[in-house]
Interface confidence: low
């Protein structure tokens, strides 16, 4: 699968998700650690069991499912609560449905998610790696009533699918509250009056207002009686009203932090999974940045520096002890142009982070136009173009002329090599998997490829031209203030 | 722009102020090459004569124009033939590309912006009291997939496939009167790409009523054809 599956099939022998707490809430011990418990199963003894970090696993085929050694010295191990994969049926509204049904309720064939024909759409799998938009299977990435798909019929853009409901109880949605916390999706109190004093209509009733927010359509949202609820990601709990002139209204729910909150005061929170606008910033090239941002410019989540999945790499806390490589925070251990990280998207190895450069004041600084170097091939050029044969090229291209991603210079798979490594050529700029020309090849910059059948190939690096202002590239960095 | 903030001067160097020949700002536009500006067709409904309009490039303030600002007459108007809300202006002389006047990039034909992509709108339009009037403002908004935007509680089926929605469903931030014709740009890899032309909305910055923008990628073939043949 091209995404980290956070659910288990059967006893979870093949579970490779990131749950790292036991069912009793104890943090798991790292599999590679010997404290507080000496493990019988470790990455060294069981290399194929996925014993990364401190994630729950089932290396011994335990019928009770994934488990881990705990960080509690008094409790050697404990089991983890991992959701069953919804492969044959769906819980709730099918947000985690993982099955292979690919026909709509009227029998239309589904359009593949990675296709834009016959219907152009914005649910692009590479931009939503955690939504599991595989092939043309029915999915629910957008809080619809149940899984759906775009159809192959040009006259019908999309339609719901008929997915059987699971008979097993749905997974717990976490703690519930009798007061308002956040947008109140877990509010389970008994308030049944709106802010202007209208009585709420029963969720199961269709008068005076017909609607689809029914207990049948939202079985996990506790649409009991006529109590205010937030089944669909609005700003706060709400209900349809018994006044035929007022279709629905928000409710006044006392806040969990004891001060009563009116709907006007409710901070409208971003819909789930919107990239948070991180307000911290970095100085210079960000080597000193020690903030907690862990999101890339395109909204991808960062991979933990000590993890080797989905990307194997050399930028570990052990190799770079002073670079602050904690958790999965954005960092710049290798003097790149700004903080970056490896991403949790298996198809995108690394990206820069969604961070701004700090400006001492709010005044804008006009960046000077790029300096044009005379074509001295020994002078490394930071731009994404080369002079001469590109021996001094230090740009960021990392794919070959055929579009194949380059192998990291420090990596030994899929190709083992010893001549051109960062250690043997410390001044050749063999950083990450960037195209380089360490041997002055007349063909220009090249790299080892990630295609096991192709050892190396050249990269398509253009010759540098005189400075010009390219479209879409302001010379003053925009402020990028958040929308609200 | 309602909400958002005042932009750093010249940080959106493709932003155009479309003006009457007497100098009054009434719409935005986007410089897409030294000789061409993209705007909304409804901005040109007052007059079919190019001489009725002029464009201002490189400005930050709406009224006290800085010395480096370029003021250029319009020589021809091209309305999209199927009457979609998009139009091209040919300038009577090419703009001088400087650090303050740079075109935006066009998307590849039929490119679709992913749901929830964060993009930016800019303009000198109505601020509805949210400060910054008279200065170029910007705001960051997520694109909302048409399927969601067309839901009953949002724009209820009104958005066409040649349009896109962007906005916070909580309201508070939006383009508004006077921003029409201006850009919605999204950052892709290393540059800003013009994905939308500000078109219409149900009021400005109202909850559950995102703004609607013409989807530029659906008109790239037309745009490039007009530029090539004229």
């Amino acid at each position: 699968k091209v995404y980290l599956s956070e659910c288990k099939t059967g006893n979870g022998k093949n579970y490779r998700g990131t749950m790292s707490k036991t069912k009793n809430g104890i943090t798991c011990q790292k599999w590679s650690s010997t404290s507080p418990h000496r493990p019988r199963f470790s990455p060294a003894t069981h290399p194929s069991e996925g014993l990364e970090e401190n994630y729950c696993r089932n290396p011994d085929n335990d019928p009770q499912g994934p488990w881990c050694y705990t960080t509690d010295p008094e409790k050697r191990y404990d089991y983890c609560d991992i959701l069953e994969c919804e492969e044959e049926c769906m819980h709730c509204s099918g947000e985690n449905y993982d099955g292979k049904i690919s026909k709509t309720m009227s029998g239309l064939e589904c359009q593949a998610w990675d296709s834009q024909s016959p219907h152009a759409h914005g649910y692009i799998p590479s931009k939503f790696p955690n939504k599991n938009l595989k092939k043309n299977y029915c999915r629910n990435p957008d809080r619809e009533l149940r899984p759906w798909c775009f159809t192959t019929d040009p006259n019908k853009r999309w339609e719901l699918c008929d997915i059987p409901r699971c008979t097993t109880p749905p997974p717990s949605s976490g703690p519930t509250y009798q007061c308002l916390k956040g947008t109140g999706e877990n509010y389970r109190g008994n308030v049944a009056v709106t802010v202007s004093g209208h009585t709420c209509q029963h969720w199961s009733a269709q008068t005076p207002h017909t609607h689809n927010r029914t207990p049948e359509n939202f079985p996990c949202k506790n649409l009991d009686e006529n109590y205010c609820r937030n089944p669909d990601g609005k700003r706060a709990p709400w209900c349809h009203t018994t006044n035929s002139q007022v279709r629905w209204e928000y409710c006044k729910i006392p806040s969990c932090d004891s001060s009563p909150v009116s709907t006007e005061q409710l901070a409208p929170t971003a819909p789930p999974e919107l990239t948070p606008v991180v307000q911290d910033c970095y100085h210079g090239d960000g080597q000193s940045y020690r903030g907690t941002s862990s999101t890339t410019t395109t909204g991808k989540k960062c991979q933990s520096w000590s993890s080797m999945t989905p990307h194997r790499h050399q930028k570990t806390p052990e190799n770079y002890p002073n670079a602050g490589l904690t958790m999965n925070y954005c960092r710049n251990p290798d003097a790149d142009k700004g903080p970056w990280c490896f991403t949790t998207d298996p198809s995108v190895r690394w990206e820069y982070c969604n961070l701004k450069k700090c400006s001492g004041t709010e005044a804008s600084v006009v960046a000077p136009p790029p300096v044009v170097l005379l074509p001295d091939v020994e002078t490394p050029s930071e731009e994404d173009c080369m002079f001469g044969n590109g021996k001094g090229y230090r740009g960021k291209r990392a794919t070959t002329v055929t579009g194949t991603p380059c192998q990291d210079w420090a990596a030994q798979e899929p190709h083992r090599h010893s001549i051109f490594t960062p250690e043997t050529n410390p001044r050749a700029g063999l950083e990450k998997n960037y195209c380089r020309n360490p041997d002055g090849d007349v063909g220009g910059p090249w790299c080892y490829t990630t295609n096991p059948r192709k050892l190396y190939d050249y990269c398509d690096v253009p010759q540098c031209a005189a400075p010009s202002f390219d479209c879409g590239k302001p010379q003053v960095e925009p402020k990028k203030c958040p929308g609200r | 722009v309602v909400g958002g903030c005042v932009a750093h001067p010249h940080s959106w160097p493709w932003q155009v102020s479309l003006r009457t020949r007497f100098g009054m700002h009434f719409c935005g536009g986007t410089l897409i090459s030294p000789e061409w500006v993209l705007t909304a067709a409804h901005c040109l409904e007052k007059s079919p004569r190019p001489s009725s309009y002029k464009v201002i490039l490189g400005a930050h303030q709406e009224v006290n124009l800085e010395p480096h600002v370029q003021e250029i007459e319009v020589s021809r108007l091209f309305l999209e033939p199927t009457r979609k809300d998009i139009a091209l202006l040919k300038l009577s002389s090419p703009a001088v590309i400087t650090d303050k006047v740079i075109p935006a990039c066009l998307p590849s034909p039929n490119y679709v912006v992913a749901d929830r992509t964060e993009c930016f709108i800019t303009g000198w339009g109505e601020t509805q009291g949210t400060f910054g009037a008279g200065l170029l403002k910007e705001a960051q908004l997520p694109v909302i997939e048409n399927k969601v935007c067309n839901r009953y509680e949002f724009l209820n089926g009104r958005v066409q496939s040649t349009e896109l929605c962007a906005g916070h469903l909580a309201g508070g931030t939006d383009s508004c009167q006077g921003d029409s014709g201006g850009p919605l740009v999204c950052f892709e890899k290393d540059k800003y790409i013009l994905q939308g032309v500000t078109s219409w909305g149900l009021g400005c910055a109202r909850p559950n009523k995102p703004g609607v923008y013409v989807r530029v990628s659906r008109f790239v073939t037309w745009i490039e054809g007009v530029m090539r043949n004229n």
């Epitope: - | 409804h42 409904e45 009104r158 066409q160 219409w200 909305g201």
Partner: nanobody
Framework: QVQLVESGGGLVQAGGSLRLSCAAS????????MGWYRQAPGNQRELVAS???????NYAGSVKGRFTISGDSAKNTVYLHMNSLKPEDTAVYYC????????????????WGQGTQVTVSS
Amino acid sequence: QVQLVESGGGLVQAGGSLRLSCAASGRRFMVVAMGWYRQAPGNQRELVASITNGGTTNYAGSVKGRFTISGDSAKNTVYLHMNSLKPEDTAVYYCTTDVVFRDGNGQIQSNWGQGTQVTVSS
């Protein structure tokens, strides 16, 4: 203000067909939805069919399968194709449009036509 010009009404035998059309014109506006209502003597005005800018259609239960609404956004015109007409379809048919004025405050404004008589004889 938006002007609506309706045409196509008339007298027809039961089982016959008619096509109503309605064209909108006026100061700078954008149509976001168009539709047809009807009112028979002594009855309330009722929605027959509507179509939005995005192509979403909506029909009254009594006309589903017999009437088809379509629009031409380039001409700001809406059509109502009426097949298998019944005597109970006899009414004055009113065209309606929801528009947003480009130079206004963006609020939707509804506009009504004068109506065109449709009479179905048995």
